[in-house]
């Protein structure tokens, strides 16, 4: 009696279990009672990454430099090309089809997490005792200068955008 289910790496067709094509190959013709499944290798710049019964291979992704993309992993007959972004840019989506410039953290904000090829800069407001006076994609909030350790006194209070200004202590005459 004909099978209703097939083993792993097989598929059911015409009441018969046929072997799937291995990764890197596409289906040309199904097996018959007398012949094996016929498979053909994918062409150059094409791939199939699973055991399959596809009649066409997928095209490799193109990491278009005009979109700020570059190749992270070259495509093969079994794997697609993996794109990432040029330095200073990050992917706009998980599929990494285009890139945008890393955001900078404005004065008063510091970098909590530096951007990568796939994630943007994460900024955080500088808490009391810290400041950032630049717009940067790398700079963290810096601690206010400690006037006391320099035997000086605070002449001007710090803010989230400016450091404290230290000055000499008033001498008793």
């Amino acid at each position: 009696e004909p099978p209703t289910a097939c083993r792993e790496k097989q598929y059911l067709i015409n009441s018969q279990c046929c072997s799937l094509c291995q990764p890197g190959q596409k289906l040309v013709s199904d097996c018959t009672e007398f012949t094996e499944t016929e498979c053909l290798p994918c062409g150059e710049s094409e791939f199939l990454d699973t055991w399959n019964r596809e009649t066409h291979c997928h095209q490799h992704k193109y990491c278009d430099p005009n979109l700020g993309l570059r190749v992270q992993q070259k495509g093969t007959s079994e794997t697609d090309t993996i794109c990432t972004c040029e330095e200073g840019w990050h992917c706009t989506s998980e599929a990494c089809e285009s890139c945008v410039l890393h955001r900078s953290c404005s004065p008063g904000f510091g970098v909590k997490q530096i951007a990568t090829g796939v994630s943007d800069t994460i900024c955080e407001p500088c808490p009391v005792g810290f400041f950032s006076n630049v717009s940067s994609a790398f700079e963290k909030c810096h601690p206010w200068t400690s006037c006391e350790t320099k035997d000086l006194v605070v002449q001007q209070a710090g803010t989230n955008k400016t450091d404290v200004v230290c000055g000499p202590q008033d001498r008793l005459r």
Partner: antibody, heavy 119, light 113 residues
């Protein structure tokens, strides 16, 4: 028998242009990706550019980006490299090499054509 | 860009002796999808173009004598000639076939002692 024959090399002044050709025979040219690789006199190998079998994908080395253009004519079994704004450091033997869809490696190389950039 | 570093730059070995050369990449050449290391070796004899010797780290190209063998994974690779023959005098280049730009090592020159 697989054959790759480069031509078009020669002496050119800095800032000048040159077009290299690579004539392929002995295999189905349109089934293969193609590369240009160069070798400065007495030096090692430097990859220059790649074009996929169907012209869809093109990559360049940073050293030639914006100056060199790789192209192919599958009907003529030919690969090309248009070289503009040539510099002294582009002086090298230029090889074409094919890439198949199985190994994804350069499995055959031509004999090379010499490009000399000098005033 | 991936930097490929070969060592030694050159070596002189007696005929019939074993030859070992190394290649180090600045990042892994392991394809995460198919678990193959995309490290290629080319042989360039004097006055000739390069010739593909080994791909996927250890797979010999058709027609390459079995005295040539490749090994390694990730970032460290080795090419071995088990018994040096006169026709093996050449420069051997390792190549990153994992990503663009494709990059080559500086080469190891093999001579007869």
């Amino acid at each position: 028998e697989v054959q790759l024959v480069e031509s078009g090399g020669g002496l050119v002044k800095p800032g000048g242009s040159l077009r290299l050709s690579c004539a392929a025979s002995g295999f189905t040219f349109s089934d293969y990706g193609m590369h240009w690789v160069r070798q400065a006199p007495g030096k090692g190998l430097e990859w220059v550019a790649y074009i996929s079998s169907g012209n869809r994908i093109i990559y360049y080395a940073d050293t030639v980006k914006g100056r060199f253009t790789i192209s192919r004519d599958n009907a003529k079994n030919s690969l090309y490299l248009q070289m503009n704004s040539l510099r002294a450091e582009d002086t090298a033997l230029y090889y074409c090499a094919r890439q198949d869809g199985y190994r994804y490696a350069m499995d055959y190389w031509g004999q090379g054509t010499l490009v000399t950039v000098s005033s | 860009d991936i930097v490929m570093t070969q060592s030694p730059d050159s070596l002189a070995v007696s005929l019939g002796e074993r030859v070992t050369m190394n290649c180090k990449s600045s990042q892994s050449l392991l394809n995460s999808g198919n678990q193959k290391n995309y490290l290629t070796w080319h042989q360039q004899k004097p006055g000739q173009p390069p010739k593909l010797l080994i791909y996927w780290t250890s797979t010999r190209e058709s027609g390459v004598p079995d005295r040539f063998s490749g090994s390694g994974s990730g970032t460290d690779f080795t090419l071995t000639i088990s018994s040096l023959q006169a026709e093996d005098v050449a420069v051997y280049y390792c190549q990153n076939d994992y990503t663009y730009p494709l990059t080559f090592g500086g080469g190891t020159k093999v001579e007869i002692k």
